[in-house]
C-alpha cells in the first residue's frame, strides 16, 4: 500500500539503483516515485554531511522485500516511493530554493525582475528543466537579476551548491502550466530524425507517447509498429530530442508512427500510467511471481497491488488454467517496459496501475460566513482541492468554498446550507482559479446528497461541518484533486505553515473576488482564542487562526473553504472556515471547524453512503 512517512536521521543501507542531486527530500521522493524500480530513498541535506560530493545526494533504492535496514545518520531523511499513492503522485514541483545554485548546462541567460519570472521563463522554454536566479543582492553586480535556464542529461542538477543570494527551482511544465502548448496529433507512416535519448519496447504509440512525456529529455518520438520490416526493431519506441526542440527532419516510412511529448500541454497532462489491456499479446520480462486469478482485470489489480510489479501477462492457454482461474504472470524489467512483446498469443497483457493518479474512489486520509482579507492571488493548480459552491436561482452566485476530499466528496461548512438545503439549486465548480472564467458551458458538479452534521444548529457555531456527495465522480488532474484529511484526534502535530483560501470578501464590507485568494495564517491556541471570544465557547472541536495585529483573515464567501497546513511535504485539511468577529480585526482570530475531531463522522458517512469503504490511507 501507500506509505508516506518520512524517517528523520535515518539512511537506508544498500539496494541502490540510481543516485542524483536534488534540493530536498520531497523532490528526491518524487524522483523515486517515477523511477521504475525505486521503492525507497535516502536524502542527504547539506547540513548532514561534510563530504561536498555527497551534499544534496538523493539515493534511489530497490528491495525484494520492500524494506532495507535503516542506519542512523544525523540530518539524513529517508522514505518510500509514492507508487500506489493515487492523487499524491505528481511530477509537479513548485518550490523555490533560496541560497542554492542548481548546476547544469546553462543554455540561456536573461535579465528578469524576480525569481517567479525566471521560473515562468523556464516553464515556457521547451528545453528548460531547472533554473537559477541571482537576486539583486548577489555579490557580483554584473550577475544580478540573471536568470539562467538549464538542463542536464537526467533532468536533475549535475551538482547543487550553497550560494548566497541565488534562488533555484524547476520548470512547472509537469504542473501543466506551460504556455508553449502541445501537439496532440500523431503521425502514421512518418519517422522523425535527431538524437535518440532512450529506447524502450511498447505495445502501441500511445504508451510510447506517455513514456516520452515523463522522460526528462524526450521532446518527440518515433514508434516502430509490430509489422515493421526489421523484426528486431518491432515495437521499439525511440525517445528523441534536438537542439531546436522540434524534429529537424521527418521521413515517410511505412509502419512507423511519430509524435510529440505532451509535457508542454496546458491544463491537462496524460496520467503517468498505462491502463489499456492488450488482448492476444504477451509481455516478456523478469518473473516476479505467478498466481492463479479469475480474469485479466484481476491480474492487473494483482500486479498493481504488488508494488514491484511493472507489467503482467494473463495466460489463457489450457495448460495455464484450472477451473475458472488462469495464470497471471507478474513481471518487471530494468526500465519498466517489457523486454519482449509477442502477438497472436493466448495471453492478455498490460501494465501496473501503481502510478495512476486517479487512485480509488475514496476520501484521502493520513495516519500520522466568511473571504480572504490581506491575501494575494493564487496560481493555477496551487490549491487543487478548492471548490466554489454556487447557487443558481434567477442569477448564479458564489456562496461558499469547499474542499474536494475524494472523487465524489466535498467537505464544507454546514452553515452554507442555512435556508438553502435544496440539492438542485447548487452548482459545484472544481479545477478553477478565476470565477470570471465560468460561463454557461463550464462543466459543474451537481449534488446527489447533502449530509449536515446531526448536531449542527442554525446560528450556532458548533459542529459546522457538512459533506456533499456529488452526482458523478470527478477525475483527478493537476488542477482538481483532493486534500488529505488529518488522522483522527490529531493533536500532537505542530503545524507551522498554514494557509486559508477562498473567493470571499477582501474587506468586511467588500465583494466576492474574481481570483482565488490565499493567505498564510498562524494557528492560535484554543486558550488564546477563548480569551478573544469571551462571549462564545471555543470548543476542542474548533481551531483558531489569525495574527494578533489582524490584517489577514477569511471573510464572507470563504465559509466552508479550507484551512490547510503543510507538514513533512504534505498538505492536510486542518480546518473548515466557519466564523469570526468581523474580518481580520485585531485580536479576533478566525474560527474553523477542526477536521481531525470529525474523522469518525466523515468516515461513517462516506462509507455508509454507498456501502463500501471509502477511506484510503497513504500511510
Amino acid at each position: 500500500g501507500c506509505l508516506t512517512q518520512l524517517y528523520e536521521n535515518a539512511f537506508f543501507r544498500g539496494g541502490d539503483v540510481a543516485s542524483m542531486y536534488t534540493p530536498n527530500a520531497q523532490y528526491c521522493q518524487m524522483r523515486c516515485t517515477f523511477h521504475p524500480r525505486c521503492l525507497l530513498f535516502s536524502f542527504l541535506p547539506a547540513s548532514s554531511i561534510n563530504d561536498m560530493e555527497k551534499r544534496f545526494g538523493c539515493f534511489l533504492k530497490d528491495s525484494v522485500t520492500g524494506t532495507l535496514p535503516k542506519v542512523h545518520r544525523t540530518g539524513a531523511v529517508s522514505g518510500h516511493s509514492l507508487k500506489q499513492c493515487g492523487h499524491q503522485i505528481s511530477a509537479c514541483h513548485r518550490d523555490i530554493y533560496k541560497g542554492v545554485d542548481m548546476r547544469g548546462v546553462n543554455f540561456n541567460v536573461s535579465k528578469v525582475s524576480s525569481v517567479e519570472e525566471c521560473q515562468k521563463r523556464c516553464t515556457s522554454n521547451i528545453r528548460c528543466q531547472f533554473f537559477s536566479y541571482a537576486t539583486q543582492t548577489f555579490h557580483k553586480a554584473e550577475y544580478r537579476n540573471n536568470c539562467l535556464l538549464k538542463y542536464s542529461p537526467g533532468g536533475t542538477p549535475t551538482a547543487i551548491k550553497v550560494l548566497s543570494n541565488v534562488e533555484s527551482g524547476f520548470s512547472l511544465k509537469p504542473c501543466a502550466l506551460s504556455e508553449i502548448g502541445c501537439h496532440m496529433n500523431i503521425f502514421q507512416h512518418l519517422a522523425f530524425s535527431d538524437v535518440d535519448v532512450a529506447r524502450v519496447l511498447t505495445p502501441d504509440a500511445f504508451v510510447c507517447r506517455t513514456i516520452c512525456t515523463y522522460h526528462p529529455n524526450c521532446l518527440f518520438f518515433t514508434f516502430y509498429t509490430n509489422v515493421w520490416k526489421i523484426e528486431s526493431q518491432r515495437n521499439v519506441c525511440l525517445l528523441k530530442t534536438s537542439e531546436s526542440g522540434t524534429p529537424s527532419s521527418s521521413t515517410p516510412q511505412e509502419n512507423t508512427i511519430s509524435g510529440y511529448s505532451l509535457l508542454t500541454c496546458k491544463r491537462t497532462l496524460p496520467e503517468p500510467c498505462h491502463s489499456k489491456i492488450y488482448p492476444g499479446v504477451d509481455f516478456g520480462g523478469e518473473e516476479l511471481n505467478v498466481t492463479f486469478v479469475k480474469g485479466v482485470n484481476v491480474c492487473q489489480e494483482t500486479c498493481t497491488k504488488m508494488i514491484r510489479c511493472q507489467f503482467f501477462t494473463y495466460s489463457l492457454l489450457p495448460e495455464d488454467c484450472k477451473e475458472e482461474k488462469c495464470k497471471c504472470f507478474l513481471r518487471l524489467s530494468m526500465d519498466g517496459s517489457p523486454t519482449r512483446i509477442a502477438y497472436g498469443t493466448q495471453g492478455s497483457s498490460g501494465y501496473s496501475l501503481r502510478l495512476c493518479n486517479t487512485g480509488d474512489n475514496s476520501v484521502c486520509t493520513t495516519k500520522t460566513s466568511t473571504r480572504i482579507v490581506g491575501g494575494t492571488n493564487s496560481s493555477w493548480g496551487e490549491w487543487p482541492w478548492q471548490v466554489s459552491l454556487q447557487v443558481k436561482l434567477t442569477a448564479q452566485r458564489h456562496l461558499c468554498g469547499g474542499s474536494l476530499i475524494g472523487h465524489q466528496w466535498v467537505l464544507t461548512a454546514a452553515h452554507c446550507f442555512d435556508g438553502l438545503p435544496l440539492q438542485d439549486v447548487w452548482r459545484i465548480y472544481s479545477g478553477i482559479l478565476n470565477l470570471s472564467d465560468i460561463t454557461k458551458d463550464t462543466p459543474f458538479s451537481q449534488i446527489k446528497e447533502i449530509i449536515i452534521h446531526q448536531n449542527y444548529k442554525v446560528s450556532e457555531g458548533n459542529h459546522d461541518i457538512a459533506l456533499i456527495k456529488l452526482q458523478a465522480p470527478l477525475n483527478y488532474t493537476e488542477f482538481q484533486k483532493p486534500i488529505c484529511l488529518p488522522s483522527k484526534g490529531d493533536t500532537s502535530t505542530i503545524y507551522t505553515n498554514c494557509w486559508v483560501t477562498g473567493w470571499g470578501f477582501s474587506k468586511e464590507k467588500g465583494e466576492i473576488q474574481n481570483i482565488l485568494q490565499k493567505v498564510n495564517i498562524p494557528l492560535v491556541t484554543n486558550e488564546e482564542c477563548q480569551k478573544r471570544y469571551q462571549d462564545y465557547k471555543i470548543t476542542q472541536r474548533m481551531v483558531c487562526a489569525g495574527y494578533k495585529e489582524g490584517g489577514k483573515d477569511a471573510c464572507k464567501g470563504d465559509s466552508g473553504g479550507p484551512l490547510v497546513c503543510k507538514h513533512n511535504g504534505m498538505w492536510r485539511l486542518v480546518g473548515i472556515t466557519s466564523w469570526g468577529e468581523g474580518c481580520a480585526r485585531r485580536e479576533q482570530p478566525g474560527v474553523y471547524t477542526k477536521v481531525a475531531e470529525y474523522m469518525d463522522w466523515i468516515l461513517e458517512k462516506t462509507q455508509s453512503s454507498d456501502g463500501k469503504a471509502q477511506m484510503q490511507s497513504p500511510a
Epitope: M184, I186, Q188, D204, F206, N226, S275, P279, G344
Partner: antibody, heavy 120, light 107 residues
Framework: EVQLLESGGGLVQPGGSLRLSCAAS????????MDWVRQAPGKGLEWVSS????????NYADSVKGRFTISRDNSKNTLYLQMNSLRAEDTAVYYC?????????????WGQGTLVTVSS | DIQMTQSPSSLSASVGDRVTITCRAS??????LNWYQQKPGKAPKLLIY???SLQSGVPSRFSGSGSGTDFTLTISSLQPEDFATYYC?????????FGGGTKVEIK
C-alpha cells in the same frame, strides 16, 4: 491499392448457417489482424469479431459467442466468418475491416459489405 | 463494455456552417478514439484517429479534440459532400464499441 471484398451473404432461415469470405489484396494480409463489423438495416455499427495476424488469437462479441467462428487463410489472403444458429437479429450488412496501424488507430480499410438476411 | 454516447443523434445544417458532434465514453479511454463518416449504401470511412489526428486524404475542415471521456468532431465549414452519418469508436478496450451515430442533414 488496398482492397477488401466480402462475399457469401444471402437469405437464410433462422437456425441456418452461412459462411462469409473476405478476399484481401494490395497489402501484406498475413501481417495484420482482421475484424468483422456489422450494421443492421437503419442502425449503427456493431463490432462482431477479431482475429490476430497469425490466427492464433480470436475474440467475439457476446451476442455471437459460441455461434460464429472467425478464421483466416494467409496463403489465400482470405478472412472467413462461419455463422451458425443464425437469428433474425443477425440480419445486417457484414463488413470486413482492418486496422493496419499496429497501434489501435481505427479501422482504416473496409470492404463494401455483404448483406445477410435471416428470415423464415 | 464501454458505452459510447453520441449527441445529437441528428442535426440539420447548411453549407458553410460550423458543425460540432460530441461523443462521451462511459469511462476514460485516453485518446483511443476514432471518428468515421458513412454515406448511404457505402462502407464507413476513417476520418480522425487518436482523438485528433487527421487520416491521410481527409480534408482539413475536419478536426477532432478531447481525451479521457469527452470528445468532439468539428467540421469547420460544411460542404455538400459532408452530409452523411458520423460515428465515434473507442479502441481502448475489447470489445471495440461505436457511438449510435449522428446524421447530418441538409437544412
Amino acid at each position: 491499392e488496398v482492397q477488401l471484398l466480402e462475399s457469401g451473404g444471402g437469405l437464410v432461415q433462422p437456425g441456418g448457417s452461412l459462411r462469409l469470405s473476405c478476399a484481401a489484396s494490395g497489402f501484406t494480409f498475413s501481417n495484420y489482424p482482421m475484424d468483422w463489423v456489422r450494421q443492421a438495416p437503419g442502425k449503427g455499427l456493431e463490432w462482431v469479431s477479431s482475429i490476430s495476424s497469425s490466427g492464433g488469437w480470436t475474440n467475439y462479441a457476446d451476442s455471437v459467442k459460441g455461434r460464429f467462428t472467425i478464421s483466416r487463410d494467409n496463403s489465400k489472403n482470405t478472412l472467413y466468418l462461419q455463422m451458425n444458429s443464425l437469428r433474425a437479429e443477425d440480419t445486417a450488412v457484414y463488413y470486413c475491416a482492418t486496422d493496419t496501424s499496429g497501434s489501435y488507430l481505427g479501422f482504416d480499410y473496409w470492404g463494401q459489405g455483404t448483406l445477410v438476411t435471416v428470415s423464415s | 463494455d464501454i458505452q459510447m454516447t453520441q449527441s445529437p443523434s441528428s442535426l440539420s445544417a447548411s453549407v458553410g456552417d460550423r458543425v460540432t458532434i460530441t461523443c462521451r465514453a462511459s469511462q476514460s479511454i485516453s485518446s483511443y478514439l476514432n471518428w468515421y463518416q458513412q454515406k448511404p449504401g457505402k462502407a464507413p470511412k476513417l476520418l480522425i484517429y487518436a482523438a485528433s489526428s487527421l487520416q491521410s486524404g481527409v480534408p482539413s475542415r475536419f478536426s477532432g479534440s478531447g481525451s479521457g471521456t469527452d470528445f468532439t468532431l468539428t467540421i469547420s465549414s460544411l460542404q455538400p459532400e459532408d452530409f452523411a452519418t458520423y460515428y465515434c469508436q473507442q479502441s481502448y478496450s475489447t470489445p471495440p464499441t461505436f457511438g449510435g451515430g449522428t446524421k447530418v442533414e441538409i437544412k
